[in-house]
């Protein structure tokens, strides 16, 4: 861990990020602000329905790179975007959910392609 | 090494404003947020609030959320604190202090009092 | 608000001896990222506060290897295993998991 003056958090980050959440506030969030040591995200995805859900909040940095790298679900149409630039930089973060073809869907899961629009900002 | 420079006193009269200074050095100013607390004379530390100078990104104590206004200048490293319609019950000692996860360094504190 | 309640709030000790103060929560302070965002301060008279433990159990920088802080979820304690003049003073808990950031009361610790 590092003890200097100039970092002291024995984190990548030296300080902490404040994220704008919805749909996914933890109990220690204040007035929809979340608060975390990774990433700030917005994320798309489809309900049960087929019906668009957006999401947003904060990713601890355990973890939050292989999350916001979007890995792709069979058969789950959805898109993550993640920043770290400034507080509560997910707002303005507008991922889309990535375009339905027909062959994703034809062979099964083995062969499934998902398409989707990622922007991983630092 | 980190330094967060702060005047020793201020004595200003009831119903003015005042506003309280915190130089910092020996880091990056932007790296880190600056945190407010005061201290009543033998009373415990109270947390005003909080300012991102990267971004000016401000959080409040909802208790303080009418009194103090909290700015920076990035250029010359200060952190600013503006109280407004002092009473007696603002004479206190005002720290800065910087805040990552947890707070690592206080300026020495402002001591305040308001009298006529 | 999470209230921080330290006890004792003065503890007359010897030199030598071992001090402990405990500082309890009244909600959970570990955080959503898993961290917990509990840390102890000494201020002697007439200064700022220091840093002593970070994130319950990290020592910060300079500090003495006499000062240990355990705890979790709700119960945290700072001990010191044998107290020296310099230790004297006001030690203070903190919390940074729950906005607003809160302080415990302080515990003095004085020469019996």
């Known amino acids: 861990k590092k003890e200097d003056g100039e970092s002291t958090a024995p984190t990548a980050r030296p300080k902490v990020l404040r994220c704008k959440c919805h749909h996914h506030c933890p109990e220690d969030s204040v007035n929809n602000i979340c608060s975390t040591d990774g990433y700030c995200f917005t994320m798309i995805e489809e309900d049960d329905s087929g019906t668009p859900v957006v999401t947003s909040g904060c990713l601890g940095l355990e973890g939050s790179d292989f999350q916001c790298r979007d890995t792709p679900i069979p058969h789950q149409r959805r898109s993550i975007e993640c920043c770290t630039e400034r507080n509560e930089c997910n707002k303005d973060l507008h991922p889309t959910l990535p375009p339905l073809k027909d062959r994703d869907f034809v062979d099964g899961p083995i062969h499934h392609k998902h398409h989707h629009h990622h922007h991983h900002h630092h | 090494q980190v330094q967060l420079q702060q005047p020793g006193a201020e004595l200003v009269k009831p119903g003015a404003s005042v506003k309280l200074s915190c130089k910092a050095s020996g880091y990056t100013f932007t790296n880190y947020w600056m945190q407010w607390v005061k201290q009543r004379p033998g009373q415990g530390l109270e947390w005003i609030g909080e300012?991102?100078?990267?971004?000016?990104?401000?959080l409040y104590n909802q208790k303080f959320k009418d009194k103090a206004t909290l700015t920076v200048d990035t250029s010359s490293s200060t952190a600013y604190m503006q109280l407004s319609s002092l009473t007696s019950e603002d004479s206190a000692v005002y720290y800065c202090?910087?805040?990552?996860?947890?707070?690592?360094?206080w300026g020495q504190g402002t001591t305040l009092t308001v009298s006529s | 608000d999470a209230v921080m309640t330290q006890s004792p709030l003065s503890l007359p000790v010897s030199l030598g001896d071992q001090a402990s103060i405990s500082c309890r929560s009244s909600?959970?302070?570990?955080?959503?990222?898993?961290?917990?965002?509990l840390h102890w301060y000494l201020q002697k008279p007439g200064q700022s506060p220091k840093l002593l433990i970070y994130?319950?159990?990290n020592r910060f920088s300079g500090v003495p290897d006499r000062f240990s802080g355990s705890g979790s979820g709700t119960d945290f304690t700072l001990k010191i295993s044998r107290v020296e003049a310099e230790d004297l003073g006001v030690y203070f808990c903190?919390?940074?998991?729950?906005?607003?950031?809160?302080f415990g009361s302080g515990t003095k610790l004085e020469i019996k």
């Open positions: 909600q959970s302070l570990v955080h959503s990222t898993g961290n917990t965002y």
């Open positions: 202090a910087r805040f990552g996860y947890y707070v690592d360094y």
């Open positions: 903190s919390q940074t998991t729950h906005v607003p950031f809160t």
């Open positions: 300012i991102d100078p990267s971004d000016r990104y401000t």
């Open positions: 994130k319950v159990s």
